[in-house]
């Protein structure tokens, strides 16, 4: 008789999840020589231990602590790029500007990027059928708790000038309910961070509005200022040109506004 299985509202664990995490770990340690000492089997064991046999609505930051220890990594605190709702461009940017880091450029972020996972209480099985949805089921699910944990710690590590890339095509350019708005903004350390600089990325080629005047950006400025951190904002009118100029800063067309 098949055992009754909890049906959740969200998609199930990404297929071949264990193999994917292990393969990503091996690849990361090959690409980043300073991480070549990492034992990827131990990393997988710690990752698995955070959610296997646990109720997927009852996961805590403490569950991920063994994984956090194994993911210890040097990140230059003044080279951190946060992003909200514009992940692809942020990653394209750090692929060119190699001295800057998004969370997904770290081992832990790289391992989990775009993956879903959950287990079941009291069984060692991974649930490939369904996992809890943050809104419809519960917020303390394995994926949400992981990203909240690493996002908080990433923000806490930041110093000097912190950059954030925001999507100017969205109705809420700054969204208080995003990971950036709900976690990272509130965990920047005012004693370490001097300025948060927002880069608002325009979508339309003919869009010449100053999106730094958007009400949601003013809301972000207010939140940041109340935390005794300075705020600045730049429009990136041409993201394609912006990336091109990061690649070739000496290009004559790169002196004009982008």
């Amino acid at each position: 008789v098949p055992r009754w299985r909890q049906q959740w509202s969200g998609p199930g664990t990404t297929k071949r999840f264990p193999e994917t995490v292990l393969a990503r770990c091996v690849k990361y340690t090959e690409i980043h020589p300073e991480m070549r000492h990492v034992d990827c089997q131990s990393v997988w064991d710690a990752f698995k231990g955070a959610f296997i046999s646990k109720h997927p609505c009852n996961i805590t930051e403490e569950d991920y602590q063994p994984l956090m220890k194994l993911g210890t990594q040097t990140v230059p605190c003044n080279k951190i790029l946060l992003w909200s709702r514009i992940k692809d461009l942020a990653h394209q940017f750090t692929q060119v500007q190699r001295d800057m880091f998004t969370l997904e450029d770290t081992l832990l972020g790289y391992l989990a990027d775009d993956l879903t996972w959950c287990g079941e209480f009291n069984t060692s099985k991974i649930n490939y059928q369904s996992c809890p949805d943050w809104r419809k089921d519960c917020s303390n699910n394995p994926v949400s708790v992981f990203w909240k944990t690493v996002s908080r710690r990433f923000a806490e590590a930041a110093c000097d000038v912190v950059h954030v890339m925001l999507n100017g095509s969205r109705s809420k350019i700054f969204d208080k309910n995003s990971t950036f708005g709900s976690v990272e903004v509130h965990n920047l350390q005012p004693e370490k961070v001097q300025t948060l600089e927002a880069w608002v990325i325009h979508g339309g080629r003919e869009d010449s509005r100053d999106l730094c005047q958007d009400p949601t950006i003013k809301e972000l400025e207010s939140i940041i200022s109340k935390r005794n951190i300075q705020f600045s904002c730049k429009n990136i009118y041409r993201p394609d040109k912006f990336l091109q100029c990061v690649k070739n800063p000496e290009d004559s067309s790169c002196t004009s506004e982008i």
């Epitope: 956090m68 220890k69 194994l70 993911g71 210890t72 990594q73 040097t74 990140v75 230059p76 605190c77 003044n78 770290t106 832990l108 690493v150 710690r153 990433f154 806490e156 590590a157 110093c159 350390q189 004693e191 370490k192």
Partner: nanobody
């Protein structure tokens, strides 16, 4: 600006003890959790131990549990690491850093601990 200065390293025989110190400045020390991390020759960064801002909560890597003790004196803005029963594999440069990781940008020069007979 966060600044730290580690001291107390040296050459010690296996089974011996050392006490590392880290003098911190440029920030409200008691507001920040702190960690010790280390880097062995030719190896990557390894988290060793962490302590909460108040000092009430501590945590250790499995490899040092029961041998190392982290502590802090907030009145002196100083972090400590008492290392007992030292082993050859504890040989490394030890750094103190703000936060509990896993992301660190250590600001000090570190202090070298060599365990050898």
């Amino acid at each position: 600006e966060v600044q730290v200065l580690e001291s107390g390293g040296g050459l010690v025989q296996p089974g011996g003890s050392l006490r590392l110190s880290c003098a911190a400045s440029g920030f409200t020390f008691s507001n920040f959790a702190m960690s010790w991390v280390r880097q062995a020759p030719g190896k990557g960064l390894e988290w060793v131990s962490g302590i909460s801002g108040s000092g009430g909560s501590t945590d250790y890597a499995d490899s040092v549990k029961g041998r190392f003790t982290i502590s802090r004196d907030n009145s002196k803005n100083t972090l400590y690491l008492q290392m007992n029963s030292l082993r050859a594999e504890d040989t490394a440069v030890y750094y103190c850093a703000d936060g509990t990781g896993p992301f660190f940008d250590y600001r000090g020069q570190g202090t070298l601990v060599t365990v050898s007979s």
